[in-house]
């Protein structure tokens, strides 16, 4: 037989199918020009010493073969003895290691069998009513196709599915969508309405994430507040990676889960912008404010469940950093300025009340005064910190107040509002004899003592009503008792107590009269 013709003789090997798992498969035959045809196939198993024979049986029952040698592709013309206008049955027999291996048969009309391409280029994936919709441009000159898909998960083998007939410039397929695992899809096409036409190769993998992105399991820690009034948020545990099917491992566009960090600054609600979203991994600096931090996972189908943490405010106070002067027109606070053109946010709330009751005020960008201080003033009429109670004050600063991650804490401290000098006056002053020339003076703690760092000291004043001599005794803010000694019997005295802050002198308590009785000896 001539090599270009189909040989109508018995093939040069015994006729027996070994039934082994290896061997030829995926036979495809089609017309490639007006008078030429091509068949190609895959061979699974060791290829050394394998000879391939393309077998063909005509409708008359006569059969022939082409010897392909070690090649897995063979071309022939319409003059090769194979009927191209009538149905023929083709298969491959591979002779190896003294045994024959057979491919599945294909029955087709060669002249009408056109080589179909799988979906090429961009396959768009979307979600439609709980299913997966894939869409692609129909390859040129190939309108009219049957389409199949196969899909697998990381733990399951390929499953075959049917997309149905297609007859347009774009083709599409509805496929099952998994809730919690990634899938790999491949598509193939063949000519519509051409009996027994060959399937195209499978397309490149289409990698599809689960409908629900995995919930991020991450842990954060926040550093201590530095001198710059900032603390770095650090990621202690990276999110777990999604398990992928075999063909999606490595580069798998489509299955990516993106994790984003959403910061919500709870403190200083009067600023312009309260939330900011960053890529996870971009660990920002935070001020000492309270924040809610959410990690949001999302894939091409949208966001999934998020995980939220609360980062409490840093409550470390700097009692000396803030100067407060109280005048007839109002109150002014002074603190060391950070820079020129800084915006400050002053936040205050009554101590012991819910954080949601904080009030704040945003300053216009301000430069330091000649002493290098920044200031904030308010009038009595404004009602700010007007009640006679303890307030917790925090001052934040930013050169770029519109950027959430550029706020820093300047200071946190306590302040007693209203008329602190009068409100702080100690009550229930009592005098008890202590010895022949001394008394013990006690008083109830000043309201200022409820405000950490505000009460600087008590001062006890003793006045000799005869000589009009006055002595003053400073007392530690933690004490509410003092012993006055060197007193004379029979003399009338008055005693008063006041409570002083660092910036304000207190109001004396009501005078308390006492005297030490003269002791008469028997």
């Amino acid at each position: 037989c001539r090599t270009s013709e189909c040989c109508f003789q018995d093939p040069p090997y015994p006729d027996a199918d070994s039934g082994s798992a290896s061997g030829p498969r995926d036979l495809r035959c089609y017309r490639i020009s007006s008078d030429r045809y091509e068949c190609s196939w895959q061979y699974e198993g060791p290829t050394a010493g394998v000879s391939h024979f393309l077998r063909c049986c005509l409708s008359s029952g006569r059969c022939c073969y082409f010897a392909a040698g070690s090649a897995t592709r063979l071309q022939f013309s319409d003059q090769a003895g194979v009927s191209v206008l009538y149905t023929v049955t083709l298969w491959v027999e591979s002779w190896a290691r003294n045994q024959t291996e057979k491919s599945p048969e294909v029955t087709l009309q060669l002249y009408n069998s056109v080589k179909y391409e799988p979906p090429l280029g961009d396959i768009k994936v979307s979600k439609l009513a709980g299913q997966l919709r894939m869409e692609w441009e129909t390859p040129d000159n190939q309108v009219g196709a049957e389409v199949q898909f196969r899909h697998r998960t990381p733990s399951s083998p390929w499953k075959l599915g049917d997309c149905g007939p297609q007859d347009d410039d774009t083709e599409s397929c509805l496929c099952p969508l998994e809730m919690n695992v990634a899938q790999e899809f491949q598509l193939r096409r063949r000519q519509l309405g051409s009996q027994g036409s060959s399937w195209s190769k499978w397309s490149s993998p289409v990698c599809v994430p689960p409908e629900n992105p995995p919930q991020p399991q991450v842990r954060f820690s926040v550093e201590q507040l530095g001198q710059d009034g900032r603390r770095r948020l650090t990621l202690k545990e990276q999110p777990t990676q999604l398990e992928l099917p075999e063909g999606c491992q490595g580069l798998a566009p489509g299955t990516e889960v993106t994790y984003r960090l959403q910061l919500h600054m709870l403190s200083c609600p009067c600023k312009a912008k309260a939330t900011r979203t960053l890529h996870l991994g971009k660990m920002p600096y935070l001020s000492g404010a309270a924040y809610n931090v959410a990690v949001i996972s999302s894939n091409q189908f949208g966001p999934g469940l998020n995980q939220t943490w609360h980062i409490p405010a840093d409550t470390h106070t700097e009692p000396v950093a803030l100067n407060i002067s109280v005048g007839t027109n109002g109150t002014t606070m002074y603190w060391p300025a950070r820079a020129q053109s800084m915006t400050y946010c002053i936040e205050w709330q009554p101590v012991g009340q819910d954080g949601g009751l904080a009030t704040c005020s945003l300053t216009a960008p301000q430069d330091p005064d000649p002493a290098g201080m920044a200031t904030y003033s308010w009038s009595r009429e404004s009602g700010a910190m007007g009640q006679e109670k303890c307030y917790y004050i925090t001052i934040f600063a930013s050169a770029h107040p519109e950027k959430l991650t550029l706020w820093s804490t300047v200071l946190s401290t306590y302040h007693f509002g209203g008329n602190a000098s009068a409100a702080g006056t100690p009550h229930h002053v009592s005098v008890k004899n202590h010895s022949l020339d001394s008394v013990s003076v006690d008083w109830a703690p000043s309201l200022l003592s409820t405000c950490p760092g505000v009460l600087k000291e008590y001062v006890v004043r003793c006045r000799d009503e005869d000589s009009k001599q006055v002595s003053e005794h400073p007392v530690q803010p933690t004490e509410t008792q003092v012993t006055l000694s060197g007193l004379r019997a029979g003399v009338a005295y008055t005693v008063q107590v006041r409570a002083d802050t660092a910036w304000l002198r207190g109001v004396w308590s009501q005078p308390q009269r006492f005297s030490i009785e003269v002791q008469v000896s028997d």
């Epitope: 710059d228 900032r230 991994g281 971009k282 600096y285 060391p336 300025a337 820079a339 050169a399 770029h400």
Partner: nanobody, 124 residues
């Protein structure tokens, strides 16, 4: 005016040394974590070294560890980068910026202030 001004760059032979300075004006440097970044031609900007505001703790990129030293003089409102054993791959424009991140990123991070940069060229 608030600004950071770098100086001290120049041309130096491999194995040589340079000391870069970053002077702050218009703001008090000791309130800020500050650091150096660099950008070589055609490459991403990368973090080189950082120094914190409070405990003066420092961070260095692996490529410069043992060769570069960062320090600050708050009285002079200046941060320094002492560079020894310079290599051709250290050639870049060096910038200082605050706050300092170990992984400079103009998109993902935000900065209070940054300078205009000083050119360092290491070549024989």
């Amino acid at each position: 005016e608030v600004q950071l001004v770098e100086s001290g760059g120049g041309l130096v032979q491999p194995g040589g040394s340079l000391r870069l300075s970053c002077a702050a004006s218009g703001f008090t440097l000791d309130y800020y974590a500050i650091g150096w970044f660099r950008q070589a031609p055609g490459k991403e900007r990368e973090g080189v070294s950082c120094i914190s505001s409070s405990d003066r703790s420092t961070w260095y990129a692996d490529s410069v560890k043992g060769r570069f030293t960062i320090s600050r003089d708050n009285a002079k409102n200046t941060v320094y980068l002492q560079m020894h054993s310079l290599k051709p791959e250290d050639t870049a424009v060096y910038y200082c910026a605050t706050p300092c991140y170990s992984d400079y990123d103009p998109e993902g991070y935000e900065y209070d202030y940054w300078g205009q940069g000083t050119q360092v060229t290491v070549s024989s």
